[in-house]
Amino acid sequence: SGVFQLQLQEFINERGVLASGRPCEPGCRTFFRVCLKHFQAVVSPGPCTFGTVSTPVLGTNSFAVRDDSSGGGRNPLQLPFNFTWPGTFSLIIEAWHAPGDDLRPEALPPDALISKIAIQGSLAVGQNWLLDEQTSTLTRLRYSYRVICSDNYYGDNCSRLCKKRNDHFGHYVCQPDGNLSCLPGWTGEYCQQPICLSGCHEQNGYCSKPAECLCRPGWQGRLCNECIPHNGCRHGTCSTPWQCTCDEGWGGLFCDQDLNYCTHHSPCKNGATCSNSGQRSYTCTCRPGYTGVDCELELSECDSNPCRNGGSCKDQEDGYHCLCPPGYYGLHCEHSTLSCADSPCFNGGSCRERNQGANYACECPPNFTGSNCEKKVDRCTSNPCANGGQCLNRGPSRMCRCRPGFTGTYCELHVSDCARNPCAHGGTCHDLENGLMCTCPAGFSGRRCEVRTSIDACASSPCFNRATCYTDLSTDTFVCNCPYGFVGSRCEFPVGLPPSFPW
């Protein structure tokens, strides 16, 4: 289906005469009749097989024909056809004079014809106009023509029907050749198939409109490429729908049994080590100083008296700490800072090495005690002196200082004041009415010259580094008890400290 269009442009009839040569009165009021028919080698009268059309009076004698297509007029003239355009045609254009208003053929006199032209040829469908001019003795007609397809018809012969649509039956426009051109987002022979969201899984996804991705049962995700696990699957995944494959650390049909409670819940406190011991169970191994199922309770680690050699224990956040007495070190004050090479035993004590020389023990002579034999044994605790005598420690033994009138080792004997030479150390005895008086030689004092008054050996503070000084009464010498980290007779040498420990 298409339209043969004829555009009349100019008609010249300068003399205003009819085909017979007779002039028109008052002028030739000209209209046209057009006949379109199948191709004839010699155009002859007969049915206008492709159609006819007439115009109103377009002008008088000579005139140009206005293009009226935009105004809804009749130029170009339209000759529609409802068949495949054959590509060839015959065209007859007659110019007629209209003496009155009735333009019907039967109303016109036979000699009202002004001119008649006939052409034939081939004509392809197209938008371009073919310009032609036909001249006779008295008239000239200029015109152009073309064949175009009707709406929705396409192709070289206007034989291909194509009506654009955007509905359930298709989503397309028509190309010039009549082929379908799918609207964006549609595909298929009739553009009925939507193009799904890019990446939408071919098997697991589909769409009912473009850029959509609807998932088939068992699949999910923007692109329908994630399977849906079995309903109730807790800590699992799937590779095909409705499966449930447990993640690491989970068990049970629905992966809801915690096989790795330690990792998932961190139940152990205070740096304890957690061990999984089956479904939803665990064991905490506590660090020192903690107890309880989750090692949540803090122990006082000093309760077990861990510090040795007189060390004092202090509780700390991360355990305990032993404060060691002088001469000891180590976590539990178990190591001595001295060895026998340092001559640590005083008052004639003998040194014995222990633990391959790491520490030592002193074997003390009678009357001395202490880890370094630095303490004199007090032999006066039993009050052996009679008659109010005063007991005095003297080196390895003891002696009694008797009241006037008494003598003997334990003041057990009554004597005259000077009879028994009560003045010691060569002291001179003087009898007095109420007792006696001794005059003592140099270096001695006391009522009986019994007290040695040589200079106190510790008076000069001979011990360094805050060491404790003891006087060795048997030799009038001093003994230094060194604090932790020092050795030597005066504690003047720092020892190489033991390596530091992390506690």
Epitope: H230, C233, C244, G251, G252, Q257
Partner: nanobody, 120 residues
Framework: EVQLVESGGGLVQPGGSLRLSCTAS????????IGWFRQAPGKEPEGISC????????YDADSVKGRFTISRDNAKNTVYLQMNSLKPEDTAVYYC?????????????WGQGTQVTVSS
């Protein structure tokens, strides 16, 4: 093709007993763990019990502990669920399932189910 067929379901009074059977085919029975789960109308499925390929019972749901016992007979390719002291809340469709591996860790195949109704 893996197939699991359950049987033994039915109507039982509260306090009564039932024994469900699950007969398997299409795979080497000894190699797979087998378990039971159930689903009551409008509720999520609940894992009941599972027995590993070696026969160790991997777990029992708290709701059935002491009442339900799972066992397997490899010679008959069958797993059993002995259900005692049944309660109305045990009413559900009971499914036999396997993770397709030796340990009770998931579900890959399951049967059509057997209905258990506990009602007086």
């Amino acid at each position: 093709e893996v197939q699991l067929v359950e049987s033994g379901g039915g109507l039982v009074q509260p306090g009564g007993s039932l024994r469900l059977s699950c007969t398997a085919s299409g795979f080497t029975f000894d190699d797979y763990a087998i378990g039971w789960f159930r689903q009551a109308p409008g509720k999520e499925p609940e894992g009941i019990s599972c027995i590993s390929s070696s026969g160790s019972i991997t777990y029992d749901a708290d709701s059935v502990k002491g009442r339900f016992t799972i066992s397997r007979d490899n010679a008959k390719n069958t797993v059993y669920l002995q259900m005692n002291s049944l309660k109305p809340e045990d009413t559900a469709v009971y499914y036999c399932a396997t993770p397709g591996i030796a340990a009770c860790r998931g579900i890959h195949y399951w049967g059509q189910g057997t209905q258990v109704t506990v009602s007086s």
